[in-house]
Interface confidence: medium
């Protein structure tokens, strides 16, 4: 019958205590888990990426620290704390090139843009989110490809030379055509003339073929080489820039 | 061609404290982290400590944290190593090495200093 | 800081393909593709051999390759020579900001 019986009040006063302390302590104890993309995030050489991470159950973070950092040594990617980014603790390389979008921080939701994406980005991330002394994390994965990945030196010059070898034949063509009309015609003038034929009087001379065949083929080859290579060099440029500072 | 050379090593009673240096050439030190190894006698490599490019980041073993301090000077392309309260088990050979990484192949060394070898003795 | 596991010694005979693995946890070799090996004889300082995972650098014979697989990662030797004779170390970026070797293994040219 006792169990049945009501609480005095000091055990009462306890039960509600001890449940209150449950409350309070649940709040810092780890009840969010931090959520990243499962699967790698894949950003061309100079656009901007973006990289999700949340906390589960959503709630509000604006009070949390909030951060990327990323290996080897936990180099600071981007840091948002006191409700204010921290600008000061980032690593070198990406001062200037991070943006926080916080339109959804009061549901446990943020965003890192990074801008002008490097081929030295690619690699491991780890956001992390902090509410007092707690702290859970997530680690992500960005790919970071060169927009002429598709493009080798041999398909790109395949794909420009092709149409221009195309019309160089036909024009060649054209004006083999021509020449040998023209041959005819002179051919026909000179016999009624009595004259004797050079054969060789009318050949193409060579540095003509060399001028009007070879050199328009081998023109735009080079250009599209010399092209091609700019366009590398100057998206490596970006990596090679800081290659050397691994920090 | 790249080249560490360093100094500084010598006995001393455990408590006591040394100064190791790495003196760097050949290469633009300003640009590159730098470690140290080391490696007691008859025993295998153990690293020590890094330092940023810009001497801004250091991070220690467990085992040195709170009593060696690593340090860089660019202006001199000088590696420092600051070693105090030393114990007996820091006697080793210790190397600068030069870490050649970056994001996305992790810390490495392609240059080691000749290495200088530590005594903590009494 | 515990070392990452490596056999204590491997040997072979000239002309054979030896291997040498490197086993840690997700924390360090599983976590990262950060695994280096150096290559080291008596008296002289560490060289490096392979960076990276399986990167070469540039001077050290392609008879030298590395690879990783879940936790453990390899070195492999081919066409074994008696100047490979020596210490091999593997190394690991380890989450929490720090650098771990194995704890060596001492290759003979039988």
């Known amino acids: 019958m006792a169990s049945l019986s009501r609480p005095s009040l000091p055990s009462c006063l306890c039960s509600f205590l001890l449940l209150l302390l449950l409350q309070v302590s649940s709040s810092y104890a780890g009840q969010f888990r931090v959520i990243g993309p499962r699967h790698p995030i894949r950003a061309l050489v100079g656009d901007e990426v973006e990289l999700p991470c949340r906390i589960s159950p959503g709630k509000n973070a604006t009070g949390m620290e909030v951060g990327w950092y990323r290996p080897p040594f936990s180099r600071v990617v981007h840091l948002y704390r006191n409700g204010k980014d921290q600008d000061g603790d980032q690593a070198p390389e990406y001062r200037g090139r991070t943006e926080l979008l916080k339109d959804a921080i009061g549901e446990g939701k943020v965003t890192l843009r990074i801008r002008n994406v490097r081929f030295s980005d690619e690699g491991g991330f780890t956001c992390f989110f902090r509410d007092h002394s707690y702290q859970e994390e997530a680690a992500m994965e960005l790919k970071v490809e060169d927009p002429f990945y598709w493009v080798s030196p041999g398909v790109l010059v395949l794909l420009a030379v092709l149409p221009v070898l195309l019309l160089q034949i036909t024009v060649g063509l054209i004006f083999l055509c021509l020449q040998y009309r023209l041959r005819g015609k002179l051919r026909a003038e000179i016999e009624n003339l009595h004259r004797t034929f050079d054969p060789h009087f009318l050949r193409v001379p060579c540095w003509k073929i060399t001028l009007f065949v070879i050199v328009p083929v081998l023109g735009p080859l080079v250009a599209l080489i010399i092209c091609y290579n700019w366009l590398h060099r100057r998206l490596a440029g970006q990596f090679l820039e800081e290659l050397r500072n691994p920090f | 061609q790249v080249q560490l050379v360093q100094s500084g090593g010598g006995v001393v009673q455990p408590g006591r404290s040394l100064r190791l240096s790495c003196a760097a050439s050949?290469?633009?030190?300003?640009?590159?982290?730098m470690h140290w190894v080391r490696q007691a006698p008859g025993k295998g490599l153990e690293w020590v400590a890094v330092i940023s490019y810009d001497g801004s980041n250091k991070y220690y073993a467990d085992s040195v944290k709170g009593r060696f301090t690593i340090s860089r000077d660019n202006s001199k392309n000088t590696l420092y190593l600051q070693m105090n309260s030393l114990r007996a088990e820091d006697t080793a050979v210790y190397y600068c090495?030069?870490?050649?990484?970056?994001?996305?192949?992790?810390?490495?060394?392609?240059?080691w200093g000749q290495g200088t070898l530590v005594t903590v003795s009494s | 800081q515990s070392a990452l596991t490596q056999p204590a010694s491997v040997s072979g005979s000239p002309g054979q393909s030896i291997t040498i693995s490197c086993t840690g946890t997700s924390s360090d070799v599983g976590g990262y593709n950060f695994v280096s090996w150096y290559q080291q004889h008596p008296g002289k300082a560490p060289k490096l051999m392979i960076y990276?995972?399986?990167e070469r650098p540039s001077g050290v014979s392609n008879r030298f390759s590395g690879s990783k697989s879940g936790n453990t990662a390899s070195l492999t030797i081919s066409g074994l020579q008696a100047e490979d004779e020596a210490d091999y170390y593997c190394s690991s970026y380890r989450s929490r900001d720090a650098l771990v070797f194995g704890g060596g293994t001492k290759l003979t040219v039988l």
């Open positions: 050949g290469f633009t030190f300003s640009s590159y982290a």
């Open positions: 090495a030069r870490d050649a990484g970056g994001d996305s192949s992790g810390p490495y060394f392609d240059y």
């Open positions: 990276a995972v399986s």
